[in-house]
Amino acid sequence: HTAAQDNCTCPTNKMTVCSPDGPGGRCQCRALGSGMAVDCSTLTSKCLLLKARMSAPKNARTLVRPSEHALVDNDGLYDPDCDPEGRFKARQCNQTSVCWCVNSVGVRRTDKGDLSLRCDELVRTHHILIDLRHRPTAGAFNHSDLDAELRRLFRERYRLHPKFVAAVHYEQPTIQIELRQNTSQKAAGDVDIGDAAYYFERDIKGESLFQGRGGLDLRVRGEPLQVERTLIYYLDEIPPKFSMKRLT
């Protein structure tokens, strides 16, 4: 089914307008901002969600060290251009004709330029590192319990195939979730790791995109997991192209 039939809402995307005007009177939902039809049985693409958001009123070491090419989304919100499939267009420009290239999760991967800037292809983000710091608890979490709970979360809540959760690392109080998905691995119908990471980020920030509750509160074997901060690193299949000036 496309959406919840009983009251015609989109369980996986609250930033939609739904009406029973689909084939045979079925409930059909369109994303705010773009008006594109969305499949409510899975996650909506990050590009359409950002567009909707902008249109809405208002050694023994086990932790991963992000690679020198890892990107962090420092630019924040912008109103993106999405292709007909809801993916980010490789080149994004603002209203003052400043343009830049983005990766498949919409994060800038080049210096900003003008309208002459070329972005030949949409470069895929194939590795995402979600870095969480949790608040003090009654005791350290058991690593295997934590691993199982986070894998369950990504499988059940975000519908991400388990093979794309590459690892869960834990060194109290830091938790790292590694998501990996190469172009060749992603089959039709598979949730994109970028979309799953975005839904997770919004959940942690108490801004759930799912219909219903405002956020996501995790517990591991009954123990409340209260997140103190979240950092997300993005690794692309082709390293980003920034001038040396930005790196100093």
């Epitope: 608040r135 608890t137 009654a138 005791g139 942690i204 920030k205 108490g206 801004e207 759930s208 509750r213 405002g214 956020g215 509160d217 517990r219 074997r221 009954g222 123990e223 409340p224 209260q226 103190e228």
Partner: antibody
């Protein structure tokens, strides 16, 4: 249905200790922590701490460290709180509470145990 | 520790009126906010969690709003049974309650 049933009122002398209970039923006891909350007469609510019955791990509000001790007994699905070195400041109603199934808010509450400290 | 400041501390209202209670956190609590209703001699009752989500069985005249550090509880068309003390509580960093707002009928 889910229930938290607390022990009856207590009248105790200054300097003594008191131990109250909170019997949980209607759900798997080890799946949720049990919180304890204090309410002095005519005043607001104050979080004391929680115990995780799964592993007996405890977390306390700094203010209540050394004052309250939380324990649990899986076999009887009961949580206990002992308050020691009682003074008039400890005269209050003490509630146990269980979190909501989806959030860390407190969804199910015991009826409260009234403690009066008086010589 | 996160401080929760609730205002006003008391409210005198007429039946059928609307009322809004405000709760301010000392830092961003990312919508990890609950509202409770407590009647004399009773335990608190959870009305709203996640800042806006109404719990099962809570009348629709209650609603929660806000984000960041500032949150509100609104009650429209006040009924006799709404006379109580209302508390906000943050659960982003441990658990802290606001001082309470006592609702009385004029």
């Amino acid at each position: 249905q889910i229930q938290l049933v607390q022990s009856g009122p207590e009248l105790v002398k200054p300097g003594a200790s008191v131990k109250m209970s909170c019997k949980a039923s209607g759900y798997t006891f080890t799946t949720y922590v049990i919180h304890w909350v204090k309410q002095k007469p005519g005043q607001g609510l104050e979080w004391i701490g929680y115990i995780n019955p799964n592993n007996d791990g405890t977390k306390y509000n700094e203010k209540f460290k050394g004052k309250a001790t939380l324990i649990s007994d899986k076999s009887s699905t009961t949580a206990y709180m002992e308050v020691r070195g009682l003074t008039s400041e400890d005269s209050a109603v003490y509630y146990c509470a269980r979190p909501h199934f989806e959030t860390h808010a407190m969804d199910y509450w015991g009826q409260g145990t009234s403690v009066t400290v008086s010589s | 520790d996160i401080q929760m400041t609730q205002s006003p501390s008391s409210f005198s209202v007429s039946l059928g009126d609307s009322v809004t209670i405000t709760c301010k956190a000392s830092e961003d609590i990312f919508n990890r906010l609950a509202w409770y209703q407590q009647k004399p001699g009773n335990a608190p009752r959870l009305l709203i969690s996640g800042a806006t989500s109404l719990e099962t069985g809570v009348p629709s005249r209650f609603s929660g709003g806000g984000s960041g550090k500032e949150y509100t509880l609104s009650i429209t068309s006040l009924q006799n049974e709404d006379v109580a003390t209302y508390y906000c509580q943050q659960y982003w960093n441990t658990w802290t309650f606001g001082g309470g707002t006592k609702l009385e009928i004029k």
